[in-house]
């Protein structure tokens, strides 16, 4: 799902507004590209990425990709346009304020990806199943 922002083009740039018509600034995201990670078997992890970047385009969201194979674990943090696939996958959760990891099928490795649309939201990546809910009351309890 693409975030529920109205988009219009000016000089080939997307001007993104929220539901109230206020201009939405480009996202601030953690942006360390691919780094080795020690995040493993945890409900959530911090990215340990010291680079906070403004995204190039207002429509971009924050993305985190966690990968584990026989040799290492990596965490990738970037900005990306949710209208475009990333690692061949659609960013289904781009409107989420939290980066809730979902497993994707990739041969030869364990591959999780999340996307989110609040500032630096890819700094805290969440694996725990209890966060993967569509129940807003439960979300309220969890995030308080």
């Amino acid at each position: 799902t693409i975030p529920p922002h109205v988009q219009k083009s000016v000089n080939n740039d997307m001007i993104v507004t929220d539901n109230n018509g206020a201009v939405k600034f480009p996202q601030l995201c953690k942006f360390c590209d691919v780094r080795f990670s020690t995040c493993d078997n945890q409900k959530s992890c911090m990215s340990n990425c010291s680079i906070t970047s403004i995204c190039e385009k207002p429509q971009e969201v924050c993305v985190a990709v966690w990968r584990k194979n026989d040799e290492n674990i990596t965490l990738e943090t970037v900005c990306h346009d949710p209208k475009l696939p990333y690692h061949d996958f659609i960013l289904e959760d781009a409107a989420s304020p939290k980066c809730i990891m979902k497993e994707k099928k990739k041969p030869g490795e364990t591959f999780f990806m999340c996307s989110c649309s609040s500032d630096e939201c890819n700094d805290n990546i969440i694996f725990s199943e209890e966060y993967n809910t569509s129940n807003p009351d439960l979300l309220l309890v969890i995030f308080q």
Partner: nanobody
Framework: QVQLQESGGGLVQPGGSLRLSCAAS????????VAWYRQPPGQQREGVAH???????IYADSVKGRFTVSRDNAKNTVYLEMNSLKPEDTAVYYC??????WGQGTQVTVS
Amino acid sequence: QVQLQESGGGLVQPGGSLRLSCAASGIILSSKAVAWYRQPPGQQREGVAHSSVSGTTIYADSVKGRFTVSRDNAKNTVYLEMNSLKPEDTAVYYCTAPVGHWGQGTQVTVS
């Protein structure tokens, strides 16, 4: 080594004007989106203005009509012209450009 350096801040009376500069080295600003952020005392950082490579600039509602961003590509500098300043504009102002480049900030006090 990429560096962004803000300057031009200071103490100004309400209704006054300031022009902030963001000078870059190690990066060509004409090929980058550049944004101005500010952090009022004891508050969260907030977006002020965002200037895209193609020249489209968006402004926060709180500064629209009072603040203007301009670029001088020859000087590799981006400016934030601030008019009709209000006490609530008091903050440390930062410029930033992808990927992850931030200046040290310049203090603006309206009092």
